[in-house]
């Protein structure tokens, strides 16, 4: 990276807490907390299923798929009213992420 800042390189994130709840059948709820050092015009988001700094415009317009939140090979679709997104795996399994 052309410029480093503090312990976290500018534009990068690290996961500091993760929680999974598998108590419900056929459904796993995962929550993750990350620390990010985002540069001007960016905000913490998700890229390739990992915390990342993304353009603030994406969050503002709720064009979540522009973050490239899904893994390679998956398809991304916005949820109705842009409350989040789905990642569809080649086999048809769907992972849904809602933004709160």
């Amino acid at each position: 990276q052309f410029l480093k800042e503090g312990q976290l390189a500018a534009g990068t994130c690290e996961v500091i807490a993760a929680h999974r709840d598998s108590s419900q059948p056929r459904r796993t709820i995962a929550r993750q907390t990350a620390r990010c050092a985002c540069r001007k015009g960016q905000i913490a988001g998700t890229t390739r299923a990992r915390p990342a700094c993304v353009d603030a415009r994406i969050i503002k317009t709720k064009q979540w798929c522009d973050m490239l939140p899904c893994l390679e090979g998956e398809g991304c679709d916005l949820l109705i009213n842009r409350s989040g997104w789905t990642c569809t795996q080649p086999g048809g399994r769907i992972k849904t992420t809602t933004v709160s």
């Epitope: 990276q1 534009g11 015009g41 603030a56 798929c65 522009d66 398809g75």
Partner: antibody, heavy 113, light 110 residues
Framework: QSLEESGGRLVTPGTPLTLTCTAS????????MSWVRQAPGKGLEWIGI?????TTYYANWAKGRFTISTASTTVDLMITSPTTEDTATYFC?????FGYGLWGPGTLVTVSS | ELVLTQSPSVQVNLGQTVSLTCTAD??????ASWYQQKPGQAPVLLIY???SRPSGVPDRFSGSSSGNTATLTISGAQAGDEADYYC?????????????FGGGTQLTVT
């Protein structure tokens, strides 16, 4: 997974030309797609990018000269009013936060009167 | 607007190590990528995020970064490494997004 450009040909100055990049084996909804050109004997020149939402950005020098649009499996680049300086090989490239890891072989555009 | 400067040409002896540099005229907060292009072919991604190598790229190729300079190092240069090498980085965000290539370095292996 592959990309292939088409539409390159000899055109006269001022005649609009549309190039098409066809994607195979992956979904455009999970990548950024860019157009890059290379004049004969010169370096690479980024033209612009289209996000999965259809949002586009262009190099400062390319604004107003090019238009990028996308469909389900294709990304188009329109050269609105070609000049001789637009003679080049045009590449489409698939990118994400890790750089542009997949490129098409390129299509040659020659602008001449 | 960000400008990336590369030496136009560099020569290296077969089996030797060579470093190609890419200098930004202003400090950028974005990662550098490196591309290799052989005559008549499309570019190939060699290094992303300053130091990472895509699968399939030999570990003879490595990247580093310090200050406003990114460096591509080729250890044990081979005849097949003769090509043009381009550095690139994104510049700006939001409504001002740009992707910038350096002018390229032509590497000759003798």
């Amino acid at each position: 997974q592959s990309l292939e450009e088409s539409g390159g040909r000899l055109v006269t100055p001022g005649t609009p030309l549309t190039l098409t990049c066809t994607a195979s084996g992956f979904s455009l909804s999970t990548y950024y797609m860019s157009w890059v050109r290379q004049a004969p004997g010169k370096g690479l020149e980024w033209i612009g990018i289209v996000y999965p939402s259809g949002t586009t950005y262009y190099a400062n020098w390319a604004k107003g000269r090019f238009t990028i649009s996308t469909a389900s499996t294709t990304v188009d680049l329109m050269i609105t009013s070609p000049t001789t300086e637009d003679t080049a090989t045009y590449f489409c490239a698939r990118g994400d936060s890790f750089g542009y890891g997949l490129w098409g072989p390129g299509t040659l555009v020659t602008v001449s009167s | 607007e960000l400008v990336l400067t590369q030496s136009p040409s560099v020569q290296v002896n077969l089996g030797q190590t060579v470093s190609l540099t890419c200098t930004a005229d202003t400090l950028s907060r974005s990662y550098a990528s490196w591309y290799q292009q052989k005559p008549g072919q499309a570019p190939v991604l060699l290094i992303y995020r300053d130091t990472s190598r895509p699968s399939g790229v030999p570990d003879r190729f490595s990247g580093s970064s310090s200050g406003n300079t990114a460096t591509l190092t080729i250890s044990g240069a081979q005849a097949g490494d003769e090509a043009d090498y381009y550095c690139a980085t994104s510049d700006g965000s939001g409504s001002n997004y740009q992707y910038v290539f350096g002018g390229g370095t032509q590497l000759t292996v003798t």
